[in-house]
């Protein structure tokens, strides 16, 4: 049935950058400035997506495909598509709806992005603190006693950090 | 169609006020954050302002805090800035900004930007 319906229906014959016109007898029109058709048999073609504001355009709008944007310097991209851009903050920072704000003692962001997160603690892997933490690093922990022992490894890397986000407020 | 458009933007004196507006259409204005946000010539992008959906929460960059005030107008789909006391380094393009949904619970991004509209102080 389908293949039927291809052979009868002469917009399946529309390539992609034009529209099906019904107003000319179904005849394959190219797509007005500003907008496009990604695939073919269309019978209208989409608005090309602006990027307006902090947007702005990776890849400009062709017949055949739409925009594509990011942010200015300042902002980043959020969501698919960078369908929204969100303030940048400095390290040692955190994003609230208040604004960008230092992180709390005993947490730390080194990205320009995410939440302030815990400094780890050294002890519930029995190591001591090695170099204290700040609001922009995490605390470097150093051997435990037992590791002192000659040939063991000094300092263990701080455990490896979450993936940004945003907590709610 | 989705829609921000500023305006009120000007040429005005250090001390001077400017009153900026953004007229929304194409969604419910009522149901979002809206934020301010701004670009100096040659710097990075700053966030200026925000306000929630009903107008009782109000947050503003340190630069601006006690000379520049956020408002809006749900019955008429409209967002303002009142700028007081303007100093040369307010001088930017200035953009009015819908808060993406989510805005506030998951997130800080802003969906939709108007074109701007251009502050300059100068003497």
């Known amino acids: 049935f389908e293949r039927t319906r291809s052979l009868q229906d002469p917009c399946s014959n529309c390539p992609a950058g034009t529209f099906c016109d019904n107003n000319r007898n179904q005849i394959c029109s190219p797509c007005p400035p500003n907008s496009f058709s990604s695939a073919g048999g269309q019978r209208t073609c989409d608005i090309c997506r602006q990027c307006k504001g902090v947007f702005r355009t990776r890849k400009e709008c062709s017949s055949t495909s739409n925009a594509e944007c990011d942010c200015t310097p300042g902002f980043h991209c959020l969501g698919a598509g960078c369908s929204m851009c969100e303030q940048d903050c400095k390290q040692g920072q955190e994003l609230t709806k208040k604004g960008c704000k230092d992180c709390c003692f005993g947490t730390f962001n080194d990205q320009k992005r995410g939440i302030c997160r815990p400094w780890t603690n050294c002890s519930l892997d029995g190591k001591s603190v090695l170099v204290n933490g700040t609001k922009e690093r995490d605390v470097v922990c150093g051997p435990s006693p037992a590791d002192l022992s000659p040939g063991a490894s000094s300092v263990t890397p701080p455990a490896p950090a979450r993936e940004p986000g945003h907590s709610p407020q | 169609e989705v829609q921000l458009v500023e305006s009120g933007g000007g040429l005005v004196q250090p001390g001077g006020s400017l009153r900026l507006s953004c007229a929304a259409s194409g969604f419910t204005f009522r149901s979002y954050w809206m934020n301010w946000v701004r670009q100096a010539p040659g710097k990075e992008a700053e966030w200026v302002a925000n306000i929630n959906p009903d107008g009782s929460e109000k947050y503003y960059v340190d630069s601006v805090q006690g000379r520049h005030t956020i408002s809006r107008d749900n019955a008429k789909n409209s967002l303002f800035l009142e700028m007081n006391s303007l100093r040369v380094e307010d001088t930017a393009l200035y953009y009015c900004?819908?808060?993406?949904?989510?805005?506030?619970?998951?997130?800080?991004?802003?969906?939709?930007w108007g074109q701007g509209t251009t502050v300059t102080v100068s003497s």
């Open positions: 900004a819908r808060g993406g949904p989510g805005y506030g619970d998951l997130h800080y991004g802003m969906d939709v």
